[in-house]
């Protein structure tokens, strides 16, 4: 019919039905990072608290060794905030002779590792030049979006410089995912 | 079985089932803040519009006196954006003699008050140094994550300086939560 | 009953029930923007990738000509991130004689167009002054919130300056929505 741009939506009993409280979910919070080996040209991954304080994993969503493990296929909302802090970046010495005027930067990447693809997939990236005038700076980068994931996929959060991550409070730096 | 790392996920009819349209939800939008008393060492809480324009509360999620009231226990996604604006911060006078070079900052905290814990819990914090060169600056801080809440919990948004909050538009500063 | 502060929540089989996997959902990713005509005093809309890479639309959520089309009424979570990058903004020449000290800015707006209202509604806005000292700057603006939408509504993402949008990677600039 002309103008009938959408399929009718009144027939709404679909299968399978499932209780929302049984869906895989996790909210992980920051811990102090122990220096770990990471390969050149690869951002290091953060590790996380998964059971103390505000942190939890439930309904077969598990955390192990920097990774959130996806226990069932479906569409997930994935989010992370990383708060960075540091001393004045190089470029704040404004146009100083003999110093390249390229800004420093901070970057967060949420990465998916999957059996079905040979290399990690960057799902989300937040990247920001840092060119602060004050002596100490701090700021968060927040990311969140929906992705179709497969059972067995692994998620991690990578950062450009692990030494700049604020690990002091669980509400400042965190990582989570839930099945929609 | 070897390699069977997750419990089987084909058995998906769980109880209790409930229609998504019946879940507690709220999206609150900024209003002009009237000066209110707030106690020392405590960031002031914003109050909100809950029914006009884009704002709404539904399915027993109520708003009263700065607080979103949680009507049933479960996992909630909670989010807020606060847009700040101000004049040049002190520290933008670059390394000026006699002025400490500590940056000013802006902070947003989403706080939970619960009767099962004697003090408020900071769920989410976004904090940023502000050290701007231009005369007028403005910028948002966005937060969002999932938390397990109990019936009767109260949520509020606290800010470091209420006078810097941009209250001019409902799309710039907002606060919401929904049961997953 | 006296003291029963919330309606009982144990009776949880409501109608209509529907499987979560059948809900309208979309995640769109950035593409190189072709210059398009846009009207004065109106921010240009971005167009998007809707099927390649991380991008998808499903369950009657369709993308056409810069718009996400809402196929059924309900509460949706809508989000977008736009990463901007540019050369030094005017105002970084600190208090330079003869140059107004007004900061440049970057803005993202998620806009709803609906049959039932004569002009577009701004749902979400992220706006930030840009007054960088370094020669090249880049930064994201993230937005996300829940809104009640009607079947037939259209969503788009508008930006203050399309030429500053980083279109190089699908994880840097994106737009999505899903029915709750």
């Amino acid at each position: 019919l002309k103008g009938q741009e959408f399929a009718p939506s009144h027939q709404q009993v679909y299968a399978p039905l499932r209780a929302d409280g049984d869906k895989p979910r996790a909210h992980l919070t920051v811990v102090r990072q122990t220096p770990t080996q990471h390969f050149k040209n690869q951002f290091p991954a953060l590790h996380w608290e998964h059971e103390l304080g505000l942190a939890f994993t439930k309904n077969r969503m598990n955390y192990t060794n920097k990774f959130l493990l996806i226990p069932e296929s479906g569409d997930y909302f994935i989010y992370s905030q990383v708060t960075f802090r540091g001393m004045t970046s190089e470029c704040s010495e404004i146009r100083q002779a003999g110093r390249p005027n390229k800004p420093d930067s901070i970057t967060v990447v949420i990465t998916k590792v999957t059996d079905s693809y040979p290399e990690p997939t960057q799902l989300l990236m937040g990247t920001k030049s840092v060119c602060e005038v004050g002596s100490n700076w701090f700021q968060p980068i927040y990311l969140g979006a929906m992705f179709s994931l497969q059972e067995g996929d692994k998620l991690m959060v990578n950062v450009s410089d692990i030494s700049l991550v604020d690990y002091t409070k669980e509400d400042k730096t965190f990582f989570g995912a839930f099945l929609l | 079985l070897k390699g069977q790392e997750f419990a089987p996920s084909h058995q998906q009819v769980y109880a209790p089932l409930r229609a998504d349209g019946d879940k507690p939800r709220a999206h609150l939008t900024v209003v002009r803040q009237t000066p209110t008393q707030h106690f020392k060492n405590q960031f002031p809480a914003l109050h909100w519009e809950h029914e006009l324009g884009l704002a709404f509360t539904k399915n027993r999620m109520n708003y009263t006196n700065k607080f979103l009231l949680i009507p049933e226990s479960g996992d909630y996604f909670i989010y807020s954006q606060v847009t700040f604006r101000g004049m040049t911060s002190e520290c933008s006078e670059i390394r000026q003699a006699g002025r400490p070079n500590k940056p000013d900052s802006i902070t947003v905290v989403i706080t939970k008050v619960t009767d099962s814990y004697p003090e408020p819990t900071q769920l989410l914090m976004g904090t940023k140094s502000v050290c701007e060169v231009g005369s007028n600056w403005f910028q948002p801080i966005y937060l969002g994550a999932m938390f397990s809440l109990q019936e009767g919990d109260k949520l509020m948004v606290n800010v470091s300086d209420i006078s810097l909050v941009d209250y001019t538009k409902e799309d710039k500063t907002f606060f919401g939560a929904f049961l997953l | 009953l006296k003291g029963q502060e919330f309606a009982p929540s144990h009776q949880q089989v409501y109608a209509p029930l529907r499987a979560d996997g059948d809900k309208p959902r979309a995640h769109l990713t950035v593409v190189r923007q072709t210059p398009t005509q846009h009207f004065k005093n109106q921010f240009p809309a971005l167009h998007w990738e809707h099927e390649l890479g991380l991008a998808f639309t499903k369950n009657r959520m369709n993308y056409t000509n810069k718009f996400l089309l809402i196929p059924e009424s309900g509460d949706y979570f809508i989000y977008s991130q736009v990463t901007f990058r540019g050369m030094t903004s005017e105002c970084s020449e600190i208090r330079q004689a003869g140059r107004p000290n007004k900061p440049d800015s970057i803005t993202v707006v998620i806009t709803k167009v609906t049959d039932s209202y004569p002009e577009p509604t701004q749902l979400l806005m992220g706006t930030k002054s840009v007054c960088e000292v370094g020669s090249n700057w880049f930064q994201p603006i993230y937005l996300g919130a829940m809104f009640s939408l009607q079947e037939g509504d259209k969503l788009m993402v508008n930006v203050s300056d399309i030429s500053l949008v980083d279109y190089t990677k699908e994880d840097k600039t994106f737009f999505g929505a899903f029915l709750l």
């Epitope: - | 008393q37 106690f39 809480a45 109520n62 009263t64 006196n65 700065k66 607080f67 009231l69 008050v113 619960t114 009767d115 099962s116 814990y117 004697p118 003090e119 408020p120 009767g152 109260k154 | 003291g3 502060e5 919330f6």
Partner: antibody
Amino acid sequence: QVQLVQSGAEVKKPGASVKLSCKASGFDIQDTYMHWVRQAPGQGLEWMGRIDPASGHTKYDPKFQVRVTMTRDTSTSTVYMELSSLRSEDTAVYYCSRSGGLPDVWGQGTTVTVSS
Amino acid sequence: EIVLTQSPGTLSLSPGERATLSCRASSSVSYMYWYQQKPGQAPRLLIYATSNLASGIPDRFSGSGSGTDFTLTISRLEPEDFAVYYCQQWSGNPRTFGGGTKLEIK
């Protein structure tokens, strides 16, 4: 400073009702929850219930559910607890206290004596 | 309701000694709280959320435990510590207190 001041001692006959008050100062009662706890002579502490002053919502111990009513007046930062159908075993010191905000604060207590 | 059982009912110790007070819950609780009460006074919070020291409480007091078994420890008794101690759970409705442990001077 943060404090709770309770109303004075009451002597009541069996079957009567008593309404006790607890006035807060130094904090906004709506930012917390207010509880009532009682202690019979020589006995331990017994939680009766709580009110959320922001909303007026209450939670009561089931053993008091039919006899207790907690209310609040935010304009005066005062919460009230009314106990009806009094009996001799309701003779006790009644305390108000707050949760959801530190420091922990209790009122000085109100002695209620039920005697014919 | 969750029943809290405190032991011992009475503990007789001398100043300078270590006191260990136990509280057992009939079912698992998230957190335990400990109060001190002296004659004629309102209770005073000592420990919240199992192990956090309340403001103004000396660090000779500590709390520990999880699930159903919780402990309040006073590392070195001072004369002003002799009082009645109550545990309380905030996990279930109704909230419940233990019956108390009376700490007396030996």
